[in-house]
Amino acid sequence: ETDEESEEPGRRGSFVEMVDNLRGKSGQGYYVEMTVGSPPQTLNILVDTGSSNFAVGAAPHPFLHRYYQRQLSSTYRDLRKGVYVPYTQGKWEGELGTDLVSIPHGPNVTVRANIAAITESDKFFINGSNWEGILGLAYAEIARPDDSLEPFFDSLVKQTHIPNIFSLQLCGAGFPLNQTEALASVGGSMIIGGIDHSLYTGSLWYTPIRREWYYEVIIVRVEINGQDLKMDCKEYNYDKSIVDSGTTNLRLPKKVFEAAVKSIKAASSTEKFPDGFWLGEQLVCWQAGTTPWNIFPVISLYLMGEVTNQSFRITILPQQYLRPVEDVATSQDDCYKFAVSQSSTGTVMGAVIMEGFYVVFDRARKRIGFAVSACHVHDEFRTAAVEGPFVTADMEDCGYNIPQTDESTLMT
């Protein structure tokens, strides 16, 4: 059941003004142009479904071409509160406020939104990425400093008549882009308020959002070239599985990663690849135009469906999980990095997965939809796919329940 025809009014049709409003590349993120303040200050903002803060550079930084100057905005309001966000590597910190925000190639509205003005950061901004801030599109539960800070999308929906849904089409280039090309290239589309049918082929298949914090979903089965990894499905979602446009790779829990690499190695065993390649520490190159895509297997993730005991699968090609990178020394070769990596925080379906699909974040109906992207990179023999239904029993058991750590668990 793809629910294709039962969309509410206002959800159907074309969003011409929003098509092609993203730029960037999977290794450095996809960004949308936004304006902040009065008069409007234009900034490029990373689209991140794996966080919930709208945060922008607000002080000079060697990697920033421009930054938000609060003192120049007549509509800026200081919330007199700081925010500190540490990452595994790096961090950003800043001052909270609100201001008027709009998206030039988005809906024709202006909203007052919370903004974290980043005053200090470490390993956060990326040299040459061309973005100056981050738009966290996930839910309030993971907003910093706490869930009382309303995320941008919540403010947008609350203050306008825009339906509570957005969709992303991230278009991987299939070849590395130098800075000039990256600025000129189309990166994809963020459709705010609905679904654009020109951006996908076939049907949309939906998986429930398990819990509204990250965009958490449940993976029920994993196959490499049709071979089941045969793991307890809880392992696939340990400790969660999320859809995250702000992450480059498909990241898998340690046990799953090891099993998947073993299976991918076996499937591509025509020639031994060094361990450093599978760990993402080495690049592999072929003479331009000769990449033997056929020796690499497809990867299929089965996601819980909307109906009891029903699942569907999304299948990506090596064209998605081998990420094109520039050759160190010469442009005569096509070089790639293995973009599946190990995670200690669960499965992360990052840009390498999303670049195969049009992904619908249907917040109103607490579900995420997948369809084959009209812009995915493929060859004449294989294409990314979204297929179903499949019968899968006991899918609820595949979800991992993270132990509570707050004081309430100590009460008897």
Epitope: E271, F273, G276, F277, V284, C285, W286, P292
Partner: nanobody
Framework: DVQLQESGGGSVQAGGSLRLSCAAS????????MGWYRQAPGKERELVST???????SYVDSVKGRFTISQDNAKNTVYLQMNSLKPEDTAKYYC???????????????WGQGTQVTVSS
């Protein structure tokens, strides 16, 4: 697996010299290209110099006439002799290797951890 061991970095006065070396582990198909690139804080990565297995060399314009790349094929080692150093040469220098094609035509690029070169005026 390809392992790279860099050495020779350090601090030096402008006009001074340093010699970087990078030893690579054995690889079945050998190395077709080795070299050095550098990255200064807040700057783009820059390819400094390369040498191919047949001895062909190339240099970025800013180091021509001052830096010399050489190799010892028997030891899978590449050297970068840096003379007349300038403050703008201050950067972390990374060794890289590119293997020759295997039976599938695949070549592998590896890089080291980097060695810091600081040139003061």
């Amino acid at each position: 697996d390809v392992q790279l061991q860099e050495s020779g970095g350090g601090s030096v006065q402008a006009g001074g010299s340093l010699r970087l070396s990078c030893a690579a582990s054995e690889y079945t198909y050998g190395y077709c290209s080795m070299g050095w690139y550098r990255q200064a804080p807040g700057k783009e990565r820059e390819l400094v110099s390369t040498i191919t297995s047949d001895g062909s060399t190339s240099y970025v314009d800013s180091v021509k006439g001052r830096f010399t790349i050489s190799q010892d094929n028997a030891k899978n080692t590449v050297y970068l002799q840096m003379n007349s150093l300038k403050p703008e040469d201050t950067a972390k220098y990374y060794c890289y290797t590119k293997t020759c094609a295997n039976k599938l035509g695949a070549k592998f690029i590896s890089w080291g951890q980097g060695t810091q070169v600081t040139v003061s005026s």
